[in-house]
Interface confidence: low
C-alpha cells in the first residue's frame, strides 16, 4: 500500500522536511502533491510527468519545494503555516489513480525563558511567592527545577497556568534555593537562568552563649547572642529588665555578686518586624577563702603517735576533700576521716607518712586547694651499719670505720672499743694499726628526740697471718636445671686476693660460672649433676696464704627415665618373672609398679612366680623424687606363651 512518511514528523521553523514515499507502484504516468487531506486543484503544490521528466508548479507552490523522481517531496525553510496534511496523487500508466496522505507539525525554536516573581522578599510562614516562566509560548511544556532537582512533592508547592506558574505557599527558610524553569516543545528545550529565592525569616528564639550560668566573683562576663534571621537580626541586651546596649555581645569585666540576675537578649528583624527574646539567669558566687591545714602534732614519733590534720576554716554545708602525694586518699586502716571529712587522722604514723597532704573545699564551680603540708615524723635510729665490711686487717694500715643509722632527726653517734667510749663521731679513724687494735668495735646511734638508741658490734682482727677461710653457700641442696648456687669465701679481708678450685683444678671456663665481689663470690647458674664436686677457696696477701676445707655440692636431680631389666618381653608359661627398675636420681627415688594400670607394690623389684598367659600385659614402673618434686615412668609389654609354643626365658 502506498504510504507517506514525514522525516522528521516534528519540524523546527527554518529547517526542512522530507515527505518520503513508500511502496510507489511501477508503470507510472506521473504524480502530483497537494496541501491538505484531499486532491484539490486549487491547492496543488507541484505535478510531475515521468515520461517528460517535467515538473509543473501548482497554485500552492512556494518555491521552497523540490520533487524527486521517486515522488518524495522536500520542503525547505519551513514556516509555521506549513503544518498539516500533504496528499500524494499517483496516476498509474493505466490511468488508475492512487492516493496517500502524510503530515508533519511545525514548531518554533523556543527562546531562553526567564522567571518573573510576584514577591522578591517573601516573609517566612506568611507570604506566598508565585514564579512565572516567561514568555508564554503556545504548545510548550513548562518544567521547574529546584537546586537542579525536579520539584519535590509538597502540599506547599502548586503548579498552575499550564505549569507555567509555580506558587510556594507559606514560604519557609528552607525554600531559599535556586529555581529554574524550562520550556520544552517537540523540537527544542531551553532552561532559564537561576533565580535565588530570598526568604525573610526570623528572628528565631535567640541562643545565648556560653551556656554556663555560674561565675565566680572577679571573672569577666562575656555573653554572645545569636538568632537565625534574614536579614541578620539587630540585638539588644537587658539586665533585670533594664536596657543595657544594642550589641550582639555583652561584656562586663570583674563581675561581683551584684551582677547576678536575669540577662535578656532581644533579637529584632527590621524586615519581618518580629522580635524574639531569650532569658538566661546568671549567678555570681563569692570567692571562698583558701583552705589551710592545722595539725595537732607537728613532730609525731613513728609507731607511737597519731596525728590529726584538720582542714580550716570550718564552713557549714561544705564538702571537704583530701589528697596524699597528689592522689586521693588510699584505703588504709590507719587513715580515718571524721563524719564531715574535715579531719584526717593518721593512726600510728610511720616514716612513710610524711606526705605532702592537701585539703580542698568544694564549691559550686570548682575545688579550692590548700597549700601542701609535710609531716615531720620522728623515727629511728634503726640498727646502725658499719662500713667497710672487712674484719681482717694487716698491721701498719689505717683503720677507717663509718657508721650510719636511718633516723629523724639525724642520729648522734658514739664509738666504743671493747666496751670503752672512744669518741662521739660518725667516723672512727685509727692510723698505723697493730695487733693490739684487734677487738670489739661498737657503734652506738642515738636519737635525741625519741630518746632511742641502737648499737652494732663488729669484730676487727689485726694480724699479719691470714686466717683459714671457709665457704658459705646460699643453697645447700640446689635442684638440677633450676637453681643457682652462690659460694662466698669468708672472711672479707682488706688487700686480699681470692682464688677458687674445683676438684683440685683451677676454675674451668664456662658461661654458667661467674666470679664477683672481687672474686670472693663464685656463682654457678643452672646447676647440673656434674656440678656435684669439691669446691675450695683460697685467700692470699703479700705475707701469707690459706685454703678452705673443701665443700661438696649436693645437687638434687632426677628421676631420669627409668630402665626395666632384663630387656626381654617374651616369656614361657611357668617361668618366674623378675623385673628390676632403675632411675638415676638424687636422692634415690621411690619406686612403684602397675600392671595393666592396676597399682602393685612400692618396690624396686617386681617378682611374680610361675607366670601364665594371664600375666600378659603392660608393666609400668613409676619413679618419684620427693626432693625435686619430679616424677617419671616407663612402660614395658610382657607376653607369656603357653609351654612349647615359642622360645623364651625361664628364671
Amino acid at each position: 500500500k502506498l504510504t507517506i512518511e514525514s522525516t522528521p514528523f516534528n519540524v523546527a521553523e527554518g529547517k526542512e522536511v522530507l515527505l518520503l514515499v513508500h511502496n510507489l507502484p511501477q508503470h507510472l504516468f506521473g504524480y502530483s502533491w497537494y496541501k491538505g487531506e484531499r486532491v484539490d486543484g486549487n491547492r496543488q503544490i507541484i505535478g510531475y510527468v515521468i515520461g517528460t521528466q517535467q515538473a509543473t508548479p501548482g497554485p500552492a507552490y512556494s518555491g521552497r519545494e523540490i520533487i524527486y523522481p521517486n515522488a518524495s517531496l522536500l520542503i525547505q525553510n519551513i514556516i509555521q503555516n506549513d503544518t498539516g496534511f500533504y496528499t500524494l496523487h499517483v496516476i498509474k500508466s493505466d490511468l488508475v489513480n492512487e492516493e496517500a496522505t502524510g503530515q508533519f507539525r511545525v514548531y518554533p525554536e523556543l527562546p531562553k525563558p526567564s522567571i518573573s516573581s510576584n514577591n522578591s522578599k517573601p516573609v517566612e510562614d506568611k507570604d506566598a511567592v508565585a514564579f512565572t516562566c516567561e514568555p508564554e509560548t503556545q504548545d510548550a511544556t513548562y518544567l521547574w527545577w529546584v537546586n537542579n532537582q525536579s520539584l519535590p512533592v509538597s502540599p506547599r508547592l502548586q503548579l498552575s497556568n499550564g505549569n507555567r506558574t509555580l506558587t510556594l505557599f507559606n514560604v519557609t527558610r528552607n525554600d531559599t534555593a535556586s529555581y529554574k524553569c524550562e520550556t520544552q516543545n517537540p523540537v527544542s528545550a531551553r532552561r532559564s537562568d537561576s533565580v535565588i529565592l530570598n526568604v525573610l525569616y526570623g528572628p528565631d528564639a535567640p541562643t545565648i552563649s556560653p551556656l554556663n550560668t555560674s561565675y565566680r566573683s572577679g571573672e569577666n562576663l562575656n555573653l554572645s547572642c545569636h538568632a537565625a534571621s534574614n536579614p541578620p537580626a539587630q540585638y539588644s541586651w537587658f539586665v533585670n529588665g533594664t536596657f543595657q546596649q544594642s550589641t550582639q555581645e555583652l561584656f562586663i569585666p570583674n563581675i561581683t555578686v551584684n551582677n547576678s540576675g536575669s540577662y535578656t537578649c532581644q533579637a529584632h528583624n527590621s524586615d519581618t518586624g518580629l522580635n524574639r527574646t531569650t532569658v538566661t539567669t546568671i549567678t555570681v558566687y563569692a570567692e571562698p577563702p583558701k583552705p589551710f591545714i592545722t595539725s595537732n602534732n607537728s613532730n609525731p614519733v613513728e609507731d607511737e603517735d597519731a596525728v590529726a590534720l584538720t582542714c580550716e576554716p570550718e564552713i557549714q554545708n561544705t564538702t571537704y576533700l583530701w589528697w596524699v602525694n597528689n592522689q586521693s586518699l588510699p584505703v588504709s586502716p590507719r587513715l580515718q576521716l571524721s563524719n564531715d571529712n574535715r579531719t584526717l587522722t593518721l593512726l600510728s604514723v610511720t616514716r612513710n607518712d610524711v606526705g605532702p597532704y592537701e585539703c580542698g573545699i568544694q564549691n559550686e564551680l570548682s575545688v579550692d586547694h590548700s597549700d601542701p603540708v609535710i609531716l615531720n615524723v620522728l623515727y629511728g635510729p634503726d640498727d646502725p651499719t658499719i662500713s667497710p665490711s672487712y674484719t681482717y686487717y694487716r698491721p701498719g694500715v689505717n683503720l677507717s670505720l663509718s657508721c650510719h643509722a636511718a633516723s629523724n632527726p639525724p642520729a648522734q653517734y658514739s664509738w666504743l672499743i671493747d666496751g670503752n667510749i672512744q669518741q662521739h663521731t660518725q667516723e672512727l679513724f685509727i692510723s698505723n694499726i697493730t695487733e693490739k687494735n684487734s677487738g670489739l668495735y661498737t657503734c652506738q646511734a642515738n636519737n635525741s628526740a625519741s630518746g632511742h638508741s641502737r648499737t652494732t658490734v663488729k669484730t676487727i682482727t689485726v694480724s699479719a697471718e691470714l686466717p683459714k677461710p671457709s665457704i658459705s653457700s646460699n643453697n645447700s641442696k640446689p635442684v638440677e636445671d633450676k637453681d643457682a648456687v652462690a659460694f662466698t669465701c669468708e672472711p672479707e679481708a682488706q688487700n686480699t686476693t681470692y682464688l677458687w678450685w674445683v676438684n683440685g683444678q683451677s676454675l674451668p671456663v664456662s658461661p654458667r660460672l661467674q666470679l664477683s665481689n672481687g672474686n670472693r663470690t663464685l656463682t654457678l647458674f643452672n646447676v647440673t649433676r656434674n656440678d656435684a664436686r669439691a669446691y675450695v677457696c683460697g685467700i692470699q696477701n703479700s705475707v701469707s696464704a690459706n685454703r678452705s676445707d673443701p665443700v661438696t655440692l649436693d645437687v638434687l636431680y632426677g628421676p631420669d627415665t627409668p630402665i626395666i631389666s632384663p630387656p626381654d618381653s617374651s616369656y614361657l608359661s611357668g617361668a618366674n618373672l623378675n623385673l628390676s627398675c632403675h632411675s638415676a636420681s638424687n636422692p634415690s627415688p621411690q619406686y612403684s609398679w602397675r600392671i595393666n594400670g592396676i597399682p602393685q607394690q612400692h618396690t624396686q623389684v617386681l617378682f611374680i612366680a610361675k607366670i601364665t598367659p594371664n600375666n600378659n600385659g603392660t608393666y609400668a614402673c613409676f619413679v618419684s623424687n620427693l626432693a625435686t618434686g619430679r616424677n617419671n615412668s616407663i612402660v614395658k609389654s610382657i607376653t607369656v606363651s603357653a609351654s612349647g609354643t615359642s622360645p623364651g626365658l625361664s628364671a
Epitope: 529546584v146 537546586n147 532537582q149 519535590p152 512533592v153 509538597s154 502540599p155 528552607n174 534555593a177 528565631d204 528564639a205 541562643t207 537565625a228 524574639r276 531569650t278
Partner: antibody, heavy 121, light 111 residues
Framework: EVQLVESGGGLVQPGGSLRLSCAAS????????MHWVRQAPGKGLEWVGR????????KYADSVKGRFTISADTSKNTAYLQMNSLRAEDTAVYYC??????????????WGQGTTVTVSS | EIVLTQSPATLSLSPGERATLSCRAG??????????LHWYQQKPGQAPRLLIY???NRATGIPARFSGSGSGTDFTLTISSLEPEDFAVYYC?????????FGQGTKLEIK
Amino acid sequence: EVQLVESGGGLVQPGGSLRLSCAASGFNIKDTYMHWVRQAPGKGLEWVGRIDPANGNSKYADSVKGRFTISADTSKNTAYLQMNSLRAEDTAVYYCAPFGYYVSDYAMAYWGQGTTVTVSS
Amino acid sequence: EIVLTQSPATLSLSPGERATLSCRAGESVDIFGVGFLHWYQQKPGQAPRLLIYRGSNRATGIPARFSGSGSGTDFTLTISSLEPEDFAVYYCGQTYEDPYTFGQGTKLEIK
C-alpha cells in the same frame, strides 16, 4: 533541662469529654510547635495534632478533626488537648512533644511520660 | 498522607550482632536533599526516645553504635553491635508534612 509533664487522663464513657494538660519547663513553648501523639494499647504511634503557641494556629489528624481541640497558654508554658465526643478507639496513652528548630531540631526529641485515657462504658 | 513501612516486623538477634532496620516512605520526605525522617526507640511502659534525627544525625546522649542513613524514600537504622539494653521496639517517623506519620514499628528481640 527540658521536661514535659502530661496530666488529665482517666476513665470516661463514650461520648464524654476530657482535657489533657502538658506542662513544659526548660524552654519557652512559644519557640516551638507543641504536638500530641497517642499510642493505643499494643499498637504503634499515631500523630494527633499540633499547635503553634505563638499564634494559636493548629492542625489535626483526620481521625480526631472536629472532636479534639489543641490550645496553649504561653504564660503558663502549657499546652492542652480538649477531647470531646470520645470513642472507644480513642483509648490510648497520650504524649506531648515539642517540635522546632531550637528545642528539638525538627524532630520529636523530648517526650513526656504520657497520660492514659480509657474510653469505656 | 505519607505512609511509612518498616521491615522486618520482628528481628531476632543475639547481643554483639549487627542489626539493620529499614523504613520506606510512600513518597520522598526530602527537603532540598535532607530527609525529614527520624528513628525512635521505645521500651515497654516508657515513652519513645529519639535516636536519630533527620536521617543520619545522632541525638544527644545516643551511643555511637547507633547510626542512620538514607534519603528520599529509603532509610536504614543500623546498630553495629547489640547491647542487652538495645532490645526494644523501633519506630521511624516523618515530619516532612502534615499529618506527621510513624511506621508500624520493628520489634528487636533476643534470639
